[in-house]
């Protein structure tokens, strides 16, 4: 017979989910409204593409990136659709509290919609970290609590330092990677004897890992210049996304097999470092003057990842309990560091002729920039974690940790739990 | 304090292309970029372009066929150049600090900072 | 291209009045709106940058507000020296675009 889900749970989530949902219906009605002037036919379909790209990139492909688990396969892509489709309706409604409430309505536009499925997605990265520890009741608590946070990081941000939407959004990866690292730290970390094979990656399900790391490499770009206006940047910003990944393919995988003894090649690394380049890129992708230095910087991130993979998963086993397969959080914490230091370094390079005064002020305010969204991502995930490990989310067992059947209907096994 | 300096052709005939240079005193000429705006007699303003240090530049789909702009790096100076002039062209031009290219430096609208203006005339 | 709108296109008031200028985007621009003052023969000064923030300078007289499609320029008690010209600028998207402009004159 099919596991069933916990009796607890089943009271908790359904009731849990849908009243949540019925009260961002009640706020739609009476908070929002569609934009209602006319936008041109082209500008509209162009903005509307990115936008697909971009769901494109979440469901998809951080869908399918975490589902490289034995058994939390099926776990791993439908959660990451129901915190994408959760995630986006919070964060709409967000924005529109946060930067435009005093004028009445919360007018939604693409470019809204855009801005809540980027917010979104910083939820997918996160939960890579706790993922097959955690139930739905607890995802969604999480959900809430990481898009609020990096809601109001991008309005602090914004105001503070004057950043404009591309800027603030691009703290999306340090942000996410160390708010999703807190959470796990939070959480119970020893797999109990009899469990190891659980967080172990299976064929089938790294093939379809394979596949999300695969639509993320195509659509990366459209992520990095979804919010940049100006045609001249959006153009850099797509051509060094893409150098900068093409390379990082390169190198994980030539880098992979030059980190294992016999010279194979680890799907687990390859997952995560064709990507790297991507992230690295980030910040200043609109900025990067040539080819060539999106390229060296896509090189240094396959390294970088490759070698974090190798390296860092042990540690991060131990203190945060974090399976080897779930990468993304420390590897997206070292290339979105990367990606700001570039920054920085660039800004220092284009402000030489200006003055000291000038470049050292330039350079604290990045700093702060980047310190605030290290902070707010540790505390609120520290919150979120602390939250999460309350009895009223009925938590699974340890013993059913990264296992679908707690949560899934399999009429054709027969393995009772 | 940053200030901007700016000259060029005065007064055109129809068909010739006018030409204008801004120099860019006491400022980081490569975080920001530089806008062109011109405004006929009794008439609004009219953004014509943008252009960073190395060349990038954004153009005003109305003039983009007969638009070009320039950047010398070593110089502080940006240029425009504007083809095929006609009568209706006939405007004050003022060169200003656009957005910065980096958050924080600034306020990343731009436009904090004009030239005086140069008055071209298009006449034959 | 973004249509910007101004309302009214001039207007007469006296000095200490309480003056409203209004801009209409013809699609939302979310913040990104500047308001600019210009006097005859000299370069336009920025008053108002992100719809509501206050330019460094100038006096606090002069406020900003709105969001999306619908912003206004406030000045709360007119001095001589506020008779001019003043302009809206969106920059949220390119081509970058000014409103007609509106004529403020002593009455």
């Known amino acids: 017979m099919s596991s069933k889900y916990p009796r607890s749970v089943r009271r908790c989530l359904p009731l849990w989910a849908l009243t949540l949902e019925a009260a961002l219906i009640l706020l739609f009605y009476f908070f929002t409204h569609y934009d209602a002037s006319l936008e041109d036919q082209k500008g509209l379909v162009a903005s509307y593409q990115v936008g697909q790209d971009l769901t494109v990139m979440a469901a998809i492909g951080l869908g399918f990136l975490t589902s490289s688990f034995r058994r939390h396969s099926w776990s791993s892509v439908a959660f990451n659709l129901f915190m994408l489709a959760l995630g986006v309706q919070w964060a709409i409604l967000l924005d529109g509290f946060l930067s435009q409430f005093p004028s009445g309505k919360v007018v939604i536009t693409l470019f809204s919609i855009r801005l809540a499925t980027m917010s979104a997605l910083s939820v997918l990265i996160s939960v890579d970290a706790v993922l097959g520890k955690v139930n739905l009741a607890q995802l969604v608590v999480m959900v809430l609590v990481e898009v609020t946070a990096l809601g109001n990081l991008r309005m602090v941000i914004s105001n503070i330092f004057n950043t404009d939407y591309h800027m603030n959004m691009m703290h999306i990866y340090v942000f996410a990677a160390y708010f999703g690292l807190s959470v796990a730290w939070c959480l119970p970390k020893p797999l109990p004897e009899g469990t190891e094979d659980k967080d172990q990656t299976a064929t089938i399900p790294s093939l379809s890992a394979m596949l999300g790391a695969l639509f993320l490499w195509m659509f990366w770009p459209s992520f990095n210049s979804a919010l940049l206006r100006s045609p001249i940047e959006r153009k850099n910003a797509v051509f060094n996304t893409y150098y900068a990944v093409a390379v990082s393919v390169v190198t994980a995988i030539s880098g992979s097999s030059l980190a294992h003894p016999q010279g194979k090649i680890s799907k687990t690394y390859v997952h995560s470092a064709v990507l790297a380049g991507g992230v690295a890129v980030g910040t200043s992708c609109h900025l990067i003057p040539s080819p060539w230095l999106a390229m060296v910087l896509g090189l240094v991130a396959g390294l970088i990842s490759v070698g974090g993979a190798k390296y860092l998963p042990g540690c991060c086993n131990r203190v945060l309990g974090i399976p080897h397969s779930s990468i993304m959080g420390y590897n997206f914490s070292l290339l979105g560091l990367l990606g700001e230091i570039i920054y920085i370094v660039l800004l220092v390079l284009d402000t030489v002729g200006a003055g000291n005064g000038m470049i050292g002020f330039q350079v604290l305010l990045s700093i702060g920039e980047l310190s605030l969204a290290i902070v707010i991502a540790l505390m609120s995930g520290l919150l979120t974690g602390l939250l999460l490990n309350l009895k009223i989310w009925k938590a699974p067992h340890e013993a059913k940790y990264f296992d679908d059947q707690v949560f899934w209907k399999f009429p054709h096994l027969a393995v009772g739990f | 304090q940053v200030h901007l300096q700016q000259w060029g052709t005065g007064l055109l005939k129809p068909s010739e292309t006018l030409s204008l240079t801004c120099a860019v005193h006491?400022?980081?000429?490569?975080?920001?970029?530089w806008t062109w705006i011109r405004q006929p007699p009794g008439k609004a303003l009219e953004w014509i372009g943008e252009?960073?240090?190395?060349?990038?530049?954004n153009y005003n789909p109305s003039l983009k066929s007969r638009v070009t702009m320039s950047a010398d790096t070593s110089k502080n100076q940006f240029s425009l150049k504007l083809t095929s002039v006609t009568a209706a062209d006939t405007a004050v031009f003022y060169c200003?600090?656009?957005?910065?290219?980096?958050?924080?430096?600034?306020?990343?609208?731009?436009?904090?900072?004009w030239g005086p203006g140069t008055t071209v005339t298009v006449s034959s | 291209d973004i249509q910007m709108t101004q309302s009214p296109s001039s207007l007469s008031a006296s000095v200490g009045d309480r003056v409203t200028i209004t801009c209409r985007a013809s699609?939302?621009?979310?913040?990104?709106l500047v308001w600019f003052q210009q006097k005859p023969g000299i370069a336009p000064k920025r008053l108002i940058y992100?719809?509501?923030s206050l330019q460094s300078g100038v006096p606090s007289r002069f406020s900003g507000s709105g969001f999306g499609t619908e912003f206004t320029l406030t000045i709360s008690s007119l001095q001589p020296e506020d008779f001019a010209t003043y302009y809206c600028l969106q920059h949220f998207s390119y081509p970058y675009t000014f409103g007609q402009g509106t004529k403020l004159e002593i009455k």
């Open positions: 992100a719809a509501s």
């Open positions: 252009i960073n240090h190395s060349g990038g530049a």
């Open positions: 699609q939302v621009i979310r913040n990104d």
């Open positions: 006491g400022g980081s000429f490569n975080v920001y970029y």
């Open positions: 200003a600090r656009g957005r910065s290219r980096y958050s924080g430096y600034g306020f990343y609208s731009g436009m904090d900072v």
